[in-house]
């Protein structure tokens, strides 16, 4: 299953990055799981994940660094709390969980650049 996502995104000065993850038509998929993975070398670490149904909105865990909304076969993802050290390749993985058959697809990744804000100069 094809998954598309932007090649590059620049995080805001507040450390927030948003991008759209779009997957090949879900057909009759009723339950979809979206996972954001960070790739560092050959290592993949899970940043956040959410399962949503066609009946409900996308819902990440309350303590997640991600938020998102879903519309059809598009998911608008927002990652918060990013710092310069978090700069890297973020891959969107989509699983069509139910009903069968199971499909999985992974995007090529979005390179997120994070620049820590300059500290404000002291004012006399």
């Amino acid at each position: 299953m094809h998954v598309a996502q932007p090649a590059v995104v620049l995080a805001s000065s507040r450390g927030v990055a948003s991008f759209v993850c779009e997957y090949g038509s879900s057909g009759n998929a009723a339950e979809v799981r979206v996972t954001v993975l960070r790739q560092a070398g050959s290592q993949m670490t899970e940043v956040c994940a959410a399962t949503y149904t066609v009946e409900d909105e996308l819902a990440f865990l309350d303590d997640s660094t991600c938020t998102g909304t879903s519309s059809g076969n598009k998911v608008n993802l927002t990652i918060q709390g990013l710092r310069a050290m978090d700069t890297g390749l973020y891959i969107c993985k989509v699983e069509l969980m139910y009903p069968p058959p199971y499909y999985v697809g992974m995007g090529n990744g979005t390179q997120i650049y994070v620049i820590d804000p300059e500290p404000c100069p002291d004012s006399d």
Epitope: S25, S26, G27, N28, A30, E31, R33, T51, T53, V54, E55, E95, M97, Y98, P99, P100, Y102
Partner: antibody, heavy 116, light 112 residues
Framework: EIQLVQSGGDLVKPGGSVRLSCKAS????????MNWVKQAPGKGLQWMGW????????TYADDFKGRFTFSLDNAKNTAYLQINSLRAEDTAVYFC?????????WGQGTTLTVSS | DIVMTQTPLSLSVSPGEPASISCRSS???????????LEWYQQKPGQSPKLLIY???NRFSGVPDRFSGSGSGTDFTLRISRVEADDAGVYYC?????????FGGGTKLEIK
């Protein structure tokens, strides 16, 4: 308002054929699977199978392989159940039902009577 | 195929009293994603079934909180905390985890 309106039930002689219709409205037809459920007189519900309204791929329960065919007319937002070589035991109410992770919407049912 | 066995076949309950229906599957109905697609439906004579509970314990919108579902693996229960006259009908469990999906045989609830 989401609705599934069924038609096509009739009195048919054994050996004949029938096509039952299920017309959907109020939602995007190709986003949800359409299921068919049989209820013989005085009996319980029996899952017949479902058709993927996006790909057109049907899945049949074992008891409904062979004489039964699910089909679609996406332009009309309609699902069909065709039954060939009708037998007395096909006498039943047939329901269509829209499924996501459950069946919130059902047709009103259509009665098929097979008798000579 | 997974067989869903409901007990009792019928029960008669006075208004205000609790009612409980059991549904047992012939094998686990946990789907590969960890979810259990076990539902409960109510059907009244001449009507289409109505969804009460999905994924074992989630009440469908508009269903009174007198209805609750529980269970795991192969054993599931529908409970009505205080039966009302309008609850009369046949109740079916359904598993949508493993194809072919299957209904239980039904339990007829009569109000005394």
């Amino acid at each position: 308002e989401i609705q599934l309106v069924q038609s096509g039930g009739d009195l048919v002689k054994p050996g004949g054929s029938v096509r039952l219709s299920c017309k959907a409205s109020g939602y995007t037809f190709t986003n949800y699977g359409m299921n068919w459920v049989k209820q013989a007189p005085g009996k319980g519900l029996q899952w017949m199978g479902w058709i993927n309204t996006y790909t057109g791929e049907p899945t049949y329960a074992d008891d409904f392989k062979g004489r039964f065919t699910f089909s679609l007319d996406n332009a009309k937002n309609t699902a069909y159940l065709q039954i060939n070589s009708l037998r007395a035991e096909d006498t039943a109410v047939y329901f269509c039902a829209r499924r996501s992770i459950y069946y919130p919407y059902w047709g009103q049912g259509t009665t098929l009577t097979v008798s000579s | 195929d997974i067989v869903m066995t409901q007990t009792p076949l019928s029960l008669s309950v006075s208004p205000g009293e609790p009612a409980s229906i059991s549904c047992r599957s012939s094998q686990s109905i946990v789907y590969s994603n960890g979810n259990t697609y076990l539902e409960w439906y109510q059907q009244k004579p001449g009507q289409s079934p109505k969804l009460l509970i999905y994924k074992v314990s989630n009440r469908f919108s508009g269903v009174p909180d007198r209805f609750s579902g529980s269970g795991s693996g192969t054993d599931f229960t529908l409970r009505i905390s205080r039966v009302e006259a309008d609850d009369a009908g046949v109740y079916y469990c359904f598993q949508g985890s493993h194809v072919p999906w299957t209904f239980g045989g039904g339990t007829k609830l009569e109000i005394k």
